[in-house]
């Protein structure tokens, strides 16, 4: 949903659904700022490079962030 | 259950304005942009607009920019659609629709109130 | 603007099968999703395919969806035909999400 026009935020609906990390190509948190007044989290799937909104105040959420922060974690030396 | 309910169609004369209402209940409304999508009578679907879950962003077809705006309150659960300057091309059942997007897979239509505009 | 065009009527027996193809113009039609709705007289569109290929629950084996880069086309296909499949049939995608692109609409009817 992310668009190349200028408006306020990307997201057009937000999921409390966590995705599959293993669908996953990257997933971007952007803070809040002077053009979205929120946390917006959005992962980009490797299937056709597909963005979906996640809810940052999603339990299942917060602990897709925490895992996908670990993995990084051991991947860097 | 899932339902969209809409109300407020009716007919009106050229020139003239009418509201929309859809009352959303059975998910969650306030995760979820919500859209008009409008087909005339005998013809195809033609989708109007959409509402971002906040209400933050607001998109039209353009046929109908600049005289209608989409709005909703979530404290209600309730969705609108204020439409200004009516034309006859206007008539047709107007949905209220939770359709696939990038946070939702599935889609919930509501049954459609028809608007007639006609002298 | 993304343009999605449809055959304006299609008709096939009972147990037979039938495609109906749904072509972009001004973009291309694998950049994103592509959806079916199956609409019957009186009633409300319901979703019979979604990206591309995924039917819904409920929605039967005999519906599938495909799409061919090479023509820039989708295409919904209806196989082992039924009577209650007789409805109009849209194809939809983006311009770009979330800005819905439906196609014309095609009439099925089983003869």
């Known amino acids: 949903v992310p668009l190349s026009r200028t408006v306020r935020c990307t997201c057009i609906s937000i999921s409390n659904q966590p995705v599959n990390p293993r669908s996953l190509e990257k997933l971007e948190i952007i803070p809040a700022s002077q053009f979205c007044p929120r946390v917006e989290i959005i992962a980009t799937m490797k299937k056709k490079g597909e963005k979906r909104c996640l809810n940052p105040e999603s339990k299942a959420i917060k602990n897709l962030l925490k895992a996908v922060s670990k993995e990084r974690s051991k991947r860097s030396p | 259950q899932v339902q969209l309910v809409e109300s407020g169609g009716g007919v009106v004369q050229p020139g003239r304005s009418l509201r929309l209402s859809c009352a959303a209940s059975g998910f969650t409304f306030s995760n979820s942009g919500i859209h008009w999508v409008r087909q005339a009578p005998g013809k195809g679907l033609e989708w109007v607009a959409v509402i971002s879950y906040d209400g933050s962003n607001k998109f039209y077809a353009d046929s109908v920019k600049g005289r209608f705006t989409i709005s909703r309150d979530n404290s209600k659960n309730t969705l609108y659609l204020q439409m200004n300057s009516l034309r006859a091309e206007d008539t047709a059942v107007y949905y209220c629709a939770k359709l696939r997007d990038n946070a939702e897979y599935t889609d919930y239509w509501g049954q459609g109130t028809l608007v007639t505009v006609s002298s | 603007n993304f343009m999605l065009t449809q055959p304006h009527s299609v008709s096939e027996s009972p147990g037979k099968t039938v495609t109906i193809s749904c072509t972009g113009s001004?973009?291309?039609?694998?950049?994103?999703?592509v959806q079916w709705y199956q609409q019957r007289p009186g009633s409300s569109p319901t979703t019979v395919i979604y990206e591309d290929n995924q039917r819904p629950s409920g929605v039967p084996d005999r519906f599938s969806g495909s799409i061919d880069s090479s023509s820039n086309s989708a295409s919904l296909t209806i196989s082992g035909l039924k009577t209650e499949d007789e409805a109009d049939y849209y194809c939809q995608s983006y311009d770009p999400l979330p800005v819905w692109v439906f196609g014309g609409g095609t009439k099925l009817t089983v003869l």
């Open positions: 001004g973009g291309s039609i694998d950049r994103n999703y």
